[in-house]
Amino acid sequence: MMTGTIETTGNISAEKGGSIILQCHLSSTTAQVTQVNWEQQDQLLAICNADLGWHISPSFKDRVAPGPGLGLTLQSLTVNDTGEYFCIYHTYPDGTYTGRIFLEVLESSVAEHGARFQIP
């Protein structure tokens, strides 16, 4: 039975040219995380497999860094980065948990920063 829950940063905003950390946290379960997929709508950004480690899509490798933890750091943000991001946690023995984050990249300096997850 799947008892866990995924906590995410929810809806976040950041400035163009800045950086942001996409973070999900799996709680309320003792299941072992075997793999985390980070996806942006129809694209696979990165995979972190417990046995293989991280693999980042070449299309994003200059702007995406693994971590901290199972999170993903997006750098040199553009307005085209605005959209939905999904963290897909594959676990044993529970199965699959999915979290959703909506990122809005703003042109001006009025972006409301999620301080806990924002990189200066």
Epitope: Q32, Q35, E39, N49, L52, P93
Partner: nanobody, 118 residues
């Protein structure tokens, strides 16, 4: 127990093509989180090539992007690697690996030899 069996390797001339297959048999847990292809040349470390997820999203290594294509037939529990414009430096043992959704660890195949002659 799940087993992965690769096939399709062999000897090919530079510039040629090969299609590798990796079939999963046994208790495949109905779905996978990821299936991927790797290779290891003599005296070198294992190299990541390509990954496909259960949602058919793909990720490639820079070294093969544009030449190699990964695909899957979920009904047959099989993943493929189409390799075009092969070069002598592509010579290696090619392995497939799978992370099944309800499995604790990655499963590896036994490998298939690919030799590209000049």
């Amino acid at each position: 127990e799940v087993q992965l069996v690769e096939s399709g390797g062999g000897l090919v001339q530079a510039g040629g093509s090969l299609r590798l297959s990796c079939a999963a048999s046994g208790r495949t847990f109905s779905s996978y989180a990821m299936m991927g292809w790797f290779r290891q040349a003599p005296g070198k470390e294992r190299e990541f090539l390509a990954i496909i997820t259960d949602g058919s999203k793909t990720l490639y290594a820079d070294s093969v992007k544009g030449r190699f294509t990964i695909s899957a037939d979920n009904a047959k529990n099989t993943v493929y690697l189409q390799m075009n414009s092969l070069k002598p430096e592509d010579t290696a043992v090619y392995y497939c690996a799978a992370q099944f959704i309800l499995a604790r660890h990655l499963v590896w195949g036994q490998g298939t030899q690919v030799t590209v002659s000049s």
